[in-house]
Interface confidence: low
C-alpha cells in the first residue's frame, strides 16, 4: 500500500490529523523533500551571523558571518574573528607571528617559513609575519660558469598549506 | 527514477559561445542544487559551480566566474551553463550532478558532454 | 580553497584482493568525504558520503573511514566491475574541490 504522504511535495509536510493531507510549510518553516511529516525551523541569522539566502518553504536559510569574522564549519555553523595578516587566533585573542613563521591571511594559524635549503635552493626573499621566503637558485647554480637555464621556485599559491 | 540528461557532445568554434543543457526528471528540480563539474581528458574533476532552481541563487569557483554563466528553466526542469570566449583550454567533458542541501554529496550524474572546441 | 590529495594515481589488484585507496585533505574537513567511482565509458556514480555511509544500492564490499585531514575508502573481495578510477571529494567549504583520482586496474 502506498504511502499517501510519499506524494506531498516539498515546501508541505503530511498532516496525519488531517487524513494525510498535503499542508503549507507554516510561515518560518521548511521541507525541502518530499513525503516529510513535519517541516523543519528555519535556522535564524543573528548576532555574529548574518543572512546570505533567505529561508523559503523548500530550502533552510543560509548564514554568513558579520565584518571582521569568518566563516568556520559546514554551511557556516561558527563565527570566527577575524586577525590581521601576520596574526594567528589564539585563546587570548589575535596575536603575531613568531620568528620564522607566517599568515598571510585574516583567518588561520601561523605556518613555518619554507625551508628552502631542503629543496637545495637559496632563500631569495626573505620571509615576513605576512609572507612565506621565497626560494631561488640554489647556491651552485649561482657559481661562476653554472647555467642559469633554471627559473627561481615560485613561492606557493597563498593561502595553500604544502601538501 | 532520478535522471540528468545531457547532450552527448557539442562542437564550437573558439569564441564563439556555447550553452551546455542539463534536463532533471524524476525528482522535484527546485528542491535540488544543481552542479556543474568539468574533466579534461585523462585529468581529474573541477567544480565549476551550482545553481538552486527554486530562485536560481549561484555559487561559483572563482576560477571559473568569468567563464561560466549558470541558469534554469524551471517550466523544463533543465540547468543550463554557458561558456563565454571557448578556447582549446575548454575542451572537456562537463558532468551536471545534483545535491540536496549544504554538505551534501552528489548523489545523480549525467552522463557528461564532451565539449570539442575547434574551428 | 581545500586541496585534495590522493597519493597514489593508479593501483593493481586481482580479482579477490583488498584494496585501500587513500585521500588527505589540506585542513580538516569534519568528516565531509565522499567517494565517486568512475568507469571507461565516463559514468560516474555516488560511493560513499560523510566519510562511511554507504549509499543506496553500492555493495558493502565498498567501506570507507578516516577523520580531520585522512580518509580511505577500502574495497574487500575486489570484482570485475570495481575496475574503474576513484576519487574522494569534500563537502566541508566551498568551492567543492576532488582528489586527483586513483585507477585501480587489474593485475
Known amino acids: 500500500l502506498q504511502d499517501l504522504c510519499s506524494n506531498c511535495p516539498a515546501g508541505t509536510f503530511c498532516d496525519n490529523n488531517r487524513s494525510q493531507i498535503c499542508s503549507p510549510c507554516p510561515p518560518n518553516s521548511f521541507s525541502s523533500a518530499g513525503g516529510q511529516r513535519t517541516c523543519d525551523i528555519c535556522r535564524q541569522c543573528k548576532g555574529v551571523f548574518k543572512t546570505r539566502k533567505e529561508c523559503s518553504s523548500t530550502s533552510n536559510a543560509e548564514c554568513d558571518c558579520i565584518s571582521g569574522y569568518h566563516c568556520l564549519g559546514a554551511e557556516c555553523s561558527m563565527c570566527e574573528q577575524d586577525c590581521k595578516q601576520g596574526q594567528e587566533l589564539t585563546k587570548k585573542g589575535c596575536k603575531d607571528c613568531c620568528f620564522g613563521t607566517f599568515n598571510d591571511q585574516k583567518r588561520g594559524i601561523c605556518r613555518p617559513w619554507t625551508n628552502c635549503s631542503l629543496d637545495g635552493k637559496s632563500v631569495l626573499v626573505n620571509g615576513t609575519k605576512e609572507r612565506d621566503v621565497v626560494c631561488g637558485p640554489s647556491p651552485a647554480d649561482l657559481s661562476p660558469g653554472a647555467s642559469s637555464a633554471t627559473p627561481p621556485a615560485p613561492a606557493r599559491e597563498p593561502g595553500h598549506s604544502p601538501q | 527514477q532520478v535522471q540528468l540528461q545531457q547532450p552527448g557532445a557539442e562542437l564550437v568554434r573558439p569564441g564563439a559561445s556555447v550553452k551546455l543543457s542539463c534536463k532533471a526528471s524524476?525528482?522535484?528540480?527546485?528542491?535540488?542544487?544543481i552542479n556543474w563539474v568539468k574533466q579534461r581528458p585523462g585529468q581529474g574533476l573541477e567544480w565549476i559551480g551550482n545553481i538552486y532552481p527554486s530562485d536560481s541563487y549561484t555559487n561559483y569557483n572563482q576560477k571559473f566566474k568569468d567563464k561560466a554563466t549558470l541558469t534554469v528553466d524551471k517550466s523544463s526542469s533543465t540547468a543550463y551553463m554557458q561558456l563565454s570566449s571557448p578556447t582549446s583550454e575548454d575542451s572537456a567533458v562537463y558532468y551536471c550532478t545534483r545535491f540536496h542541501y549544504g554538505s551534501s554529496p552528489f548523489d545523480n550524474w549525467g552522463q557528461g558532454t564532451t565539449l570539442t572546441v575547434s574551428s | 580553497d581545500i586541496q585534495m590529495t590522493q597519493s597514489t594515481s593508479s593501483l593493481s589488484a586481482s580479482l579477490g584482493d583488498r584494496v585501500t585507496i587513500s585521500c588527505r585533505a589540506s585542513q580538516d574537513i569534519s568528516h565531509y568525504l565522499n567517494w565517486y567511482q568512475q568507469k571507461p565509458d565516463g559514468t560516474v556514480k555516488l560511493l560513499i558520503y560523510y566519510t562511511s555511509r554507504l549509499h543506496s544500492g553500492v555493495p558493502s564490499r565498498f567501506s570507507g573511514s578516516g577523520s580531520g585531514t585522512d580518509y580511505s575508502l577500502t574495497i574487500s573481495n575486489l570484482e570485475q566491475e570495481d575496475f574503474a578510477t576513484y576519487f574522494c571529494q569534500q563537502g566541508h567549504t566551498l568551492p567543492r574541490t576532488f582528489g586527483g583520482g586513483t585507477k585501480l586496474e587489474i593485475k
Open positions: 524524476g525528482y522535484i528540480f527546485t528542491s535540488y542544487w
